[in-house]
């Protein structure tokens, strides 16, 4: 039977999505106990029937990976959780409409920072996602977001930063002092979706200038 208030058993049912890995999470309510079990269903916009997620039926953990089930970039999805307590009380709650394109957050890019004597090179590696193209290969963030670009900053001293940006993967900051430490930050930006990744940071030191020794 339904509890007086579903929030007694179940709270904060939501998607947490990063780089298109879509995880459904929830919290137990004040009357939830360790032996409360949770069953997960999902569906797409306008569909009548909820689909039970295999591997996420009568589980005790408070998360369920729905990445595969929510992999269509143009679709809107819902998920819902039904909690059943040891005493037989139940509660069901659903997520808001979920669009992975709209709601996914971007992780920091994978970057290699290379020290030279008077320059620092930064090579951004393509970011894979779980999304698959029609032929089965995995798409990168660059494949999905056509306006994606990288913003790079090099902190030279407390008052001066150098900036670079673009769609290419290799960048180099020139005109640096040898044998000096610099802090680089690299972010992914997607203007059309107002997305900005957390920064990748690298602390790098230019090489000593051996030509004078």
């Amino acid at each position: 039977h339904a509890p007086e208030d579903p929030s007694d058993l179940l709270q904060h049912v939501k998607f947490q999505s990063s780089n298109f890995e879509n995880i459904l999470t929830w919290d137990s309510g004040p009357e939830g106990t360790p032996d409360t079990v949770y069953s997960i269903e999902y569906k797409t916009y306008g569909e009548r029937d909820w689909v039970a997620k295999k591997g996420c039926q009568r589980i005790t953990r408070k998360s369920c990976n729905l990445t595969v089930e929510t992999g269509n970039l143009t679709e809107l999805y819902y998920a819902r959780v039904t909690a059943v307590s040891a005493g037989g009380r139940s509660a069901t709650k659903m997520t808001d409409r979920f669009s992975s394109l709209q709601h996914t957050t971007l992780k920091p890019p994978d970057v290699t920072c290379i020290s030279k004597v008077r320059s620092i090179q930064m090579i951004v590696h393509p970011t894979p996602t779980p999304i698959r193209a029609g032929d089965g290969h995995r798409l990168t963030l660059e494949d999905i977001f056509h306006d994606l670009f990288y913003h790079l900053e090099l902190q030279v001293n407390r008052t001066y930063q150098m900036h670079l940006g673009g769609k290419q993967r290799e960048y180099e900051f020139f005109g640096l002092t040898p044998d000096t430490e610099f802090l680089g930050t690299i972010m992914i930006c997607v203007p059309t979706w107002a997305k900005e990744s957390a920064p990748y940071m690298c602390r790098v030191k230019t090489l000593p200038d051996r030509t004078w020794t």
Partner: antibody, heavy 116, light 113 residues
């Protein structure tokens, strides 16, 4: 069996307020979206807005935003439509209707008459 | 807002004959992710709430007689009652759920000739 029962309609003066209730039974209100739709006498249907009863997230028809507010009391399995600054043209039967796109279950409706 | 326009406004059909109601939307209702059309049809009898007949333009709601069928795509849709019965006398509405705000046609009244 899913049932929706509206209440709270009646006669109200222009400028007045009214709160309509929609009591759901046969399912947990938090398991599906809930909408409010109205129908003026002898006229067509007009969508007011929707709520996700689990999260409280609402979307309104811009025409009603600011004057009408949709809410839910999960513990009572009931949705509400708070209507403020009522005008004569708000006279209508008000329905609650379930689902997130089209509407599979409707209440019988409650009549709101705005008149001095 | 998407404007839904139904025709005709009213329709008189003999018992057992076919009734056809048209619904035109001001923009395409084709939903790219599943290539279905976001259109529903309802029946409303006097003093009653609307009843869902058809969704996704052509999917019949459970329990709805198979004399009711929906067709069309993009901006032009049709509800057909293949053999009109006395109990089908009602007003019929189309509704789009492609975008907010959800909007309805003005209704088509079906009567017995």
């Amino acid at each position: 069996e899913v049932q929706l029962v509206e209440s709270g309609g009646g006669l109200v003066q222009p400028g007045g307020s009214l709160r309509l209730s929609c009591a759901a039974s046969g399912y947990s209100i938090t398991a599906e979206y809930m909408n409010w739709v109205r129908q003026a006498p002898g006229k067509g249907l007009e969508w007011i807005g929707e709520i996700n009863p689990s999260t409280g997230t609402t979307t309104y028809n811009q025409k009603f935003k600011g004057r009408f507010t949709i809410s839910v009391d999960q513990s009572k399995n009931t949705a509400y439509l708070q209507m403020n600054s009522l005008r004569a043209e708000d006279t209508a039967v008000y329905y609650c209707a379930r689902f997130d796109a089209y509407f599979d279950y409707w209440g019988q409706g409650t009549l709101v008459t705005v008149s001095s | 807002d998407i404007v839904m326009t139904q025709s005709p406004d009213s329709l008189a059909v003999s018992l057992g004959e076919r009734a056809t109601i048209n619904c035109k939307s001001s923009q395409s209702l084709l939903y790219s992710s599943n290539q279905k059309n976001t259109l529903a049809w309802y029946q409303q009898k006097p003093g009653q709430p609307p009843k869902l007949l058809i969704y996704w333009a052509s999917s019949r709601e459970s329990g709805v007689p198979d004399r009711f069928s929906g067709s069309g795509s993009g901006t032009d849709f049709t509800l057909t009652i293949s053999s009109l019965q006395a109990e089908d006398v009602a007003v019929y509405y189309c509704q789009q759920y492609y975008s907010y705000p959800f909007t309805f046609g003005q209704g088509t009244k079906v009567e017995i000739k």
